[in-house]
Each structure stands twice: as structure tokens, then as C-alpha cells.
């Protein structure tokens, strides 16, 4: 079976301040099992934006219903965008591990730029 790929189709997205930003991400397979996470930035200092497993992310909603057993769409929408949200967002697939899940594959990233709110 083909190895899972993480697809972030947009290299960049531009959103006006105050609006919502949709960041698209799709998997090509459900295997290996494990959670999806979104990060802003890369490397050790990256910021967790959304974790499928746990946590409270009040500004983030998932575009698809993640409780569907066959779901492959892990796109998210971030509300009330401000200039501080600008950056490159990565959709990352983890495979299950003990005690910690293991990063398996990352999308290529989507750069979010924030335009001034129209006057």
C-alpha cells in the first residue's frame, strides 16, 4: 500500500485582519494510526495550533468532522485573524508511540499573511 502523504495544497493564503483563515490539509491514507497536529513555524520553537487528541483551541475549528472513521481531511479554520498570526503553518501526521507519539510526516507548509483590515 502507498505510504501516507500529507498534502497542503496552498503554498500561501492571505486574509484580512478580523476574518477567518482556512488552512487546508489532507492525508492520502489512514495508516499508520496516530493524531494530526497543526503548528506555526518549524523546529524546536514551533507553536502548537491544534492537536486532534486533546486540548482546548477556542479559535480553531476543523472543516471536516474528525469523528468520521474514514476522514482524511484535516483542514482547519482560525477565527479573528490578527497580524500576530502571520507565519507558516504545518500540518503534521504523527504515528502512535509510547510514551509519546512520533512525528511521521509533515506537509510542505502554508504561509499565512495578514492584510490590514479594510477601512
Amino acid at each position: 500500500e502507498d505510504e501516507l502523504q500529507v498534502i497542503q495544497p496552498e503554498k500561501s493564503v492571505s486574509v484580512a485582519a478580523g476574518e477567518s483563515a482556512t488552512l487546508r490539509c489532507a492525508m492520502t491514507s489512514l495508516i499508520p494510526v496516530g493524531p494530526i497536529m497543526w503548528f506555526r513555524g518549524a523546529g524546536a520553537g514551533r507553536e502548537l495550533i491544534y492537536n486532534q487528541k486533546e486540548g482546548h483551541f477556542p479559535r480553531v475549528t476543523t472543516v471536516s468532522e474528525l469523528t468520521k472513521r474514514n476522514n482524511l481531511d484535516f483542514s482547519i479554520s482560525i477565527s479573528n485573524i490578527t497580524p500576530a498570526d502571520a507565519g507558516t503553518y504545518y500540518c503534521v501526521k504523527f504515528r502512535k508511540g509510547s510514551p509519546d507519539d512520533v512525528e511521521f510526516k509533515s506537509g510542505a507548509g502554508t504561509e499565512l499573511s495578514v492584510r490590514a483590515k479594510p477601512s
Partner: antibody, heavy 118, light 107 residues
Framework: DVQLVESGGGVVRPGESLRLSCAAS????????MSWVRQAPGKGLEWLAG????????YYIDSVKGRFTISRDNPKNSLYLQMSSLTAEDTAVYYC???????????WGLGTLVTVSS | ALTQPASVSANPGETVKITCSGG??????YAWYQQKSPGSAPVTVI????KRPSDIPSRFSGSASGSAATLIITGVRVEDEAVYYC???????????FGAGTTLTVL
């Protein structure tokens, strides 16, 4: 506290139908997938069916496909299992269970007994 | 199908290990469910291979590797006597399965 309370069990004759209900409280019901699991007398646990949080997707074990239907009413915080063409082999305690993010179960109801007998 | 031993026994204070085999590591998540009497509500003691719900005592732990999962009870107590069911979710088939159950007797 999470609470799941099943109802609707009872004694029915072979070939008849029955609808089980599960009343949920203590959590945001509409955010969780749910399942039905049964246990026949002296036997182990058997998963029957699952349903996504919004109710659009359902999943069944082969042996009940076409006879059992899982559904939910999110505004009423309720889960249902419609069972038809019942046989003696369907005699069991039926549990509703809340699913974790990866479709295992974290909370269970107390169960409701269904007896199919002529 | 998930396979687990029919019974295990231990003295109070001992460590008990119950194994469950039959799932593929890359497509299966495991859980362990405790049932103290037939027909009573099961209680989840471990899910997601090794995650313990907050209300479950720390003597319960879980692990998974290869095609097997293990439930470990460190310092078993008389009140831990129960049937323990291994459960699995397979991401390939979208199906939940259970082992036949392991009866734990604390001598």
C-alpha cells in the same frame, strides 16, 4: 460527570423489533462519536455499531448490517439503536459507549437487557 | 481477532501482566476494559495503548509493541478481581473488536 443511561430493553418475541435509547449528560454530546456494544449471557463484549458526532456516518459489524440501525438526536442528547428481525441470539445486555478521538471507548452506560424468547 | 489468556492469578501486591495479540501495530489502537461482574457496566482502565483515565489508579498501566498490547497491574489488590477485556480499533477496517476476556483472580 459523564453519564450514559440506556433504556428500552425488555422481552420480545423472535421476529419483532425494539428501539433502544441512551440518554447522555455531563459532556457536549454533539462533539463525540458514540457506539453500541452488547454482551450475551455468559459471553464477552461485542461491538455492534458506531456513529459520527454529527450523525452522518454510521458503521456496523457484518452480523447486524441491515437489521440494526444506529442514529442520534443531538439536540436531545440521545443515541438510539433500532433493532428488527430479532432472534434468540440477540438476547444480551446492550451498552452505549462514548468514543475517544481514536474510536476506543472511555465511558459506558449501565446497560439495558434485551431478551428474545417465544 | 484479538487473543488473550482465559485466566491469570496473583497474590496481593504482585505484578500482573495480561497480554493481547492479533492486531497490527501500525493500524490498531488498544484499550483495556474492566468488568467486575457479568452484565455490569465495563470500566475503561486504559485506552490509546497506554493512556490511563484520570479516575483510574496509577497501578494500572498499558503498553503496545509489535502485534501485542499488555495491561500491567503493579501491586495488585483484591478489589482488582474482574474480567479484563482487550479492545482494539482497526484504522484499516473501521471496526472495533474485543478479546474473549481474561479472568483475574487475586488469591
Amino acid at each position: 460527570d459523564v453519564q450514559l443511561v440506556e433504556s428500552g430493553g425488555g422481552v420480545v418475541r423472535p421476529g419483532e423489533s425494539l428501539r433502544l435509547s441512551c440518554a447522555a449528560s455531563g459532556f457536549t454530546f454533539s462533539s463525540y462519536a458514540m457506539s453500541w456494544v452488547r454482551q450475551a449471557p455468559g459471553k464477552g463484549l461485542e461491538w455492534l455499531a458506531g456513529i459520527s458526532a454529527g450523525g452522518s456516518d454510521t458503521y456496523y459489524i457484518d452480523s447486524v448490517k441491515g437489521r440494526f440501525t444506529i442514529s442520534r438526536d443531538n439536540p436531545k442528547n440521545s443515541l438510539y439503536l433500532q433493532m428488527s428481525s430479532l432472534t434468540a441470539e440477540d438476547t444480551a445486555v446492550y451498552y452505549c459507549a462514548r468514543e475517544t478521538w481514536n474510536h476506543l471507548f472511555d465511558y459506558w452506560g449501565l446497560g439495558t437487557l434485551v431478551t428474545v424468547s417465544s | 481477532a484479538l487473543t488473550q489468556p482465559a485466566s491469570v492469578s496473583a497474590n496481593p501486591g504482585e505484578t500482573v501482566k495480561i497480554t493481547c495479540s492479533g492486531g497490527d501495530y501500525y493500524s490498531t489502537y488498544y484499550a483495556w476494559y474492566q468488568q467486575k461482574s457479568p452484565g455490569s457496566a465495563p470500566v475503561t482502565v486504559i485506552h490509546s495503548d497506554d493512556k490511563r483515565p484520570s479516575d483510574i489508579p496509577s497501578r494500572f498501566s498499558g503498553s503496545a509493541s509489535g502485534s501485542a498490547a499488555t495491561l500491567i497491574i503493579t501491586g495488585v489488590r483484591v478489589e482488582d478481581e474482574a474480567v479484563y477485556y482487550c479492545g482494539g480499533y482497526d484504522g484499516r477496517t473501521y471496526i472495533n473488536t474485543f478479546g474473549a476476556g481474561t479472568t483475574l483472580t487475586v488469591l
